[in-house]
């Protein structure tokens, strides 16, 4: 056959679906690879062909669209399973072609099992709610296109294993779940089960997401440098190890990159002719506020090093701050025996 533009296996799209539930999968060609949509392709006389490779097999085979009750079907650029079976797992390929043009892409589909509490190997999306921030909602995800707007499905929400009813601050409102005020205790996995009829059959869609309650933007502040500070003086003798911690608190901020760094005499540490190492550790609070510590270490400090300016810098989306450490050379204690002897006129 003539050459086909093969976009390979699109591992960016790890599609996971639950066993015994409907699944609709759009051909990724039109979403990520080609600059035209299915309608344009169809009207230009291009045909979309589907085939697959079973799990642990190398043989590409056509998809059987003649199964009882049309279990697998294709509609425009969508491959439908009504419902899926465990052995539908494999790599699926959609190919767009006519006599002069050909383009194809493969993607992995994994059919996974869930238990009665909705636990499964499914990768769960995380939805962050701000703590004590007022009413916030989560929406049952990825259910568009499964049934027409004329169909009114029933939606049941669960937290973990438990049906949400008569919860203090969590109220099911159809496709939405409203949190009147979010607390740490609201952390957990939330599942919506959407039940709808189709051609005399009843289908269920199960969607689980993880809710994480995080710090509120109302309380967010620029980075706070706890150390170095004005109360601590790093007094060292030449030859000793100099250790200066820079400890910075960062409020949780959605999509903010938190950074801590040192400068020595206003320069990058590597630009100074000294053997300096910097080690970083990070810890998080329950609401994802972050504390970063960068310890600047000079194994054998010289008197020249003790005259330098050591500044800790911190930056987040809320701003940038800097604080200098107070570094001094230790003044040797007086040697009393000699000095007292001199005082008494001894020679």
């Amino acid at each position: 056959s003539e050459r086909c533009d093969d976009w390979g296996l699109d591992t960016m799209r790890q599609i996971q679906v639950f066993e015994d539930e409907p699944a609709r999968i759009k051909c990724p060609l039109f979403e990520h690879f080609l600059k035209f949509n299915y309608s344009t392709a169809h009207s230009a006389g291009l045909t979309l062909i589907w085939y697959w490779t079973r799990q642990d097999r190398d043989l590409e085979e056509p998809i059987n669209f003649r199964l009882p009750e049309n279990r697998i079907s294709k509609e425009k650029d969508v491959l439908w399973f009504r419902p899926t079976l465990l052995n539908d797992t494999g790599n699926y390929t959609c190919m767009l072609r006519n006599t002069t043009y050909c383009s194809k892409v493969a993607f992995p589909l994994e059919v996974v099992q869930k238990d009665s509490c909705f636990n499964s190997p499914m990768k769960l999306p995380v939805h962050k709610l701000y703590i004590e921030y007022g009413i916030q909602r989560i929406t049952c995800p990825n259910v568009d296109g499964y049934f027409p707007s004329s169909v009114k499905p029933t939606i049941t929400w669960y937290m973990g294993c438990y049906k949400i009813q008569n919860f203090n601050n969590v109220i099911p409102e159809g496709m939405n779940l409203s949190f009147l005020i979010a607390f740490i205790s609201n952390n957990g996995n939330y599942t919506c089960v959407v039940t709808y009829p189709e051609n005399g059959r009843t289908f269920h869609l199960t969607r689980t997401l993880t809710v994480k309650v995080v710090g509120s933007p109302k309380n967010a502040v620029p980075p706070v440098i706890h150390s170095p500070n004005d109360h601590v003086v790093y007094e060292k003798e030449p030859g000793e190890e100099l250790l200066i911690p820079c400890t910075v608190y960062f409020s949780f901020l959605m999509d903010s990159r938190n950074e801590v760094w040192w400068t020595i005499d206003g320069k990058k540490p590597d630009d100074i002719p000294i053997d300096v190492t910097i080690n970083e550790s990070i810890s998080h609070s329950r609401t994802e506020d972050e504390t970063r510590t960068q310890i600047l270490s000079i194994k054998k400090v010289t008197s020249e090093d003790l005259k330098r300016s050591y500044v800790c810098h911190a930056r987040s989306a809320k701003g940038e701050v800097a604080k200098a450490a107070t570094v001094k050379q230790k003044v040797p204690a007086p040697r009393y025996t000699v000095e007292l002897a001199c005082g008494f006129g001894a020679t």
Epitope: P222, R257, E259, W261, K268, P269, D270, T277, I278, E280, I282, H313, R315, G319, E320, V321, A322
Partner: antibody, heavy 118, light 113 residues
Framework: QVQLVQSGAEVKRPGASVKVSCKAS????????MHWVRQAPGQGLEWMGW????????DYAQKFQDRVTMTRDTSISTAYMELSRLRSDDTAVYYC???????????WGQGITVTVSS | DIVMTQSPDSLAVSLGERATINCKSS????????????LAWYKQKPGQPPKLLIY???TRESGVPDRFSGSGSGTDFTLTISSLQAEDVAVYYC?????????FGGGTKVEIK
């Protein structure tokens, strides 16, 4: 001395992926961000993203978000950039460059030519 | 994204004369808390990677000749070559690193008149 040495030129077909490497020497690899910048033939410089080799954290330009993956191996002081679903307009010289936070990109790799052609 | 606009596109200057390149950012790139402008200037010769000349809009990178200087603040910046030398023939780029995606100007080609 401080240097970044990149892997050799690559020729790829549309739809394929390319993974290029950048080996750092002469400085503390984990102490500097590593950027990837590309330059199409006769064109200007385009920033693709950066990786913090210490934490592995990344920040990609929106344009490349769904196609680029930046990784590192601190044991061999090497950064990697993988670009998937290559198109002919990805033909360019790809540079790695280090920066100490907000001090500009002070050391650059020699660049690697990636040609995408059917 | 912050757009960086360089002018002119190209510049022909006699040896020993002053060359001035302008760069304008579509929004402020000064950090009010540190009073630093997050702007760098690079020089690129054909077939070579770029070379950092200036960071923080006006701080010269070590080893860069003092005929190169950077100035400006907020949204308007200038790179000046006080006395053009033959080895200064190159394309010059400005770049903002105030916020990601870090963006470059389109470049200014400097030639000898």
């Amino acid at each position: 001395q401080v240097q970044l040495v990149q892997s050799g030129a690559e020729v790829k077909r549309p739809g394929a992926s390319v993974k290029v490497s950048c080996k750092a020497s002469g400085y503390t690899f984990t102490g500097y961000y590593m950027h990837w910048v590309r330059q199409a033939p006769g064109q200007g410089l385009e920033w693709m993203g950066w990786i913090n080799p210490y934490s592995g954290g990344t920040d990609y330009a929106q344009k490349f978000q769904d196609r680029v993956t930046m990784t590192r191996d601190t044991s061999i002081s090497t950064a990697y950039m993988e670009l998937s679903r290559l198109r002919s307009d990805d033909t360019a010289v790809y540079y790695c460059a280090r920066s100490y936070y907000y001090y500009g990109m002070d050391v650059w790799g020699q660049g690697i030519t990636v040609t995408v052609s059917s | 994204d912050i757009v960086m606009t360089q002018s002119p596109d190209s510049l022909a200057v006699s040896l020993g004369e002053r060359a001035t390149i302008n760069c304008k950012s579509s929004q402020n790139i000064i950090n009010s808390s540190t009073n630093k402008n997050y702007l760098a200037w690079y020089k690129q010769k054909p077939g070579q990677p770029p070379k950092l000349l200036i960071y923080w809009a006006s701080t010269r990178e070590s080893g860069v000749p003092d005929r190169f200087s950077g100035s400006g603040s907020g949204t308007d910046f200038t790179l000046t070559i006080s006395s053009l030398q033959a080895e200064d023939v190159a394309v010059y780029y400005c770049q903002q690193y105030y916020s990601t995606p870090f963006t470059f100007g389109g470049g200014t080609k400097v030639e000898i008149k």
